[in-house]
Interface confidence: low
């Protein structure tokens, strides 16, 4: 995208808006190192999942990939589903920017969204009946 | 705390900063539903993990919890580590706000950070030697 030189000073703190409203530079700093792609593992997960595209043009990031566990049980070493084990989602709360007011191109609000990142396998709760 | 009223209109688009710089309301919209707490499952994971606190006051969220797989193998139904299986991290790229310039209380930049959310179990790659 277009790079715009940044003023060395701070933006003016407008009386009515500071500190609730701040200025954010959308030119993303990317300090993350590439993760091992799920495709490297995906056929070998004991609790596999599929990824569903969740798109919302009023939000940044506009596309979020949501994991959905493929089975209720877990896949054993023979590749069969073991119903004595359970696939469960791993969820994380992430920050997104929600356009607000909706029609404004340059005004957003922070929003917390719960996303499912993947699935993992758990042993079931065993209740002994006395 | 003190709430500051929001202007119903859009902020002025300053030529030199728009569209790279936008205004963000930090009063978080929280539409997410509480996740099932890891503690509900943590003793039953086949690929358990511990959480490490990563704190940075220059960042929002200032505290990020990083998962670290507890074992290289996976825990079987008997509670023993099975070295024929592997615990692997599930990573996700998240957005955070980084204060920039550093000294400004009201100016931030979006940053992408890779975090490990949890661990899952995979069957190892089996290479047949012919």
């Amino acid at each position: 995208g277009i790079m715009i030189p940044q003023s060395p000073g701070c933006p003016k703190t407008e009386d009515k808006n500071f500190p609730q409203h701040v200025r954010v530079n959308l030119n993303i700093l990317n300090r993350s190192t590439p993760a091992r792609r799920p495709s490297d593992y995906s056929k070998r997960f004991t609790s596999p999942w599929t990824l569903q595209r969740n798109e919302d043009p009023e939000r940044y990031s506009s596309v979020i990939w949501e994991a959905k566990c493929s089975h209720s049980g877990c896949i054993n070493a023979e590749g069969k589903e073991d119903h004595h084990m359970n696939s469960v989602p791993i969820q994380q709360e992430i920050l997104v920017l929600r356009r607000e007011p909706r029609h404004c191109p340059n005004s957003f609000r922070l929003e917390k969204v719960m996303v499912t990142v993947g699935c993992t396998c758990v042993t079931p709760i065993v209740r002994h009946i006395s | 705390g003190i709430m500051i009223p929001q202007s119903p209109g859009c902020p002025k688009t300053e030529d030199k900063n728009f569209p790279q710089h936008v205004r963000v309301n930090l009063n978080i919209l929280n539409r997410s539903t509480p996740a099932r707490r890891p503690s509900d499952y943590s003793k039953r994971f086949t690929s358990p993990w511990t959480l490490q606190r990563n704190e940075d006051p220059e960042r929002y969220s200032s505290v990020i919890w990083e998962a670290k797989c507890s074992h290289s193998g996976c825990i079987n139904a008997e509670g023993k580590e099975d070295h024929h299986m592997n615990s692997v991290p599930i990573q996700q790229e998240i957005l955070v706000l980084r204060r920039e310039p550093r000294h400004c209380p009201n100016s931030f930049r979006l940053e992408k950070v890779m975090v490990t959310v949890g661990c899952t179990c995979v069957t190892p790659i089996v290479r047949h030697i012919s």
Epitope: - | G1, Y60, R102, P105
Partner: nanobody, 119 residues
Framework: EVQLVESGGGLVQPGGSLRLSCAAS????????MYWVRQAPGKGLEWVAS????????YYVDSVKGRFTISRDNAKKSLFLQMNSLRAEDTAVYYC????????????WGQGTLVTVSS
């Protein structure tokens, strides 16, 4: 529990001086950038000055540059604002604030100290 207690405000004539102090407790003071923020009567908040964790750099809003000096004493967990050549427009409640991004609703701000500049 995080606590910030400001003192040193008062009534002063235009051109006069005041030194504001802020006593901090309940957190590792030396790990945080600190701010002075003010709220004039009937107005919102204005960031006045900030200082780096080790005191190596200071920053000021244009309207106070050359007149105000921010400083800190990490050993005593204290923040200061030396205000010289005071003007009527400096009349406000002055708050010290811990350099965390959120929460921004003054959970970690003091009760403030009132500075009145009037002849």
């Amino acid at each position: 529990e995080v606590q910030l207690v400001e003192s040193g405000g008062g009534l002063v004539q235009p051109g006069g001086s005041l030194r504001l102090s802020c006593a901090a407790s309940g957190f590792t003071f030396s790990s945080y950038r600190m701010y002075w923020v003010r709220q004039a009567p009937g107005k919102g908040l204005e960031w006045v000055a900030s200082i780096e964790q080790d005191g190596s750099e200071e920053y000021y809003v244009d309207s106070v540059k050359g007149r105000f000096t921010i400083s800190r004493d990490n050993a005593k967990k204290s923040l200061f604002l030396q205000m010289n050549s005071l003007r009527a427009e400096d009349t406000a409640v002055y708050y010290c604030a811990k350099g965390e991004i959120l929460p921004l609703y003054f959970d970690y701000w003091g009760q403030g100290t009132l500075v009145t500049v009037s002849s």
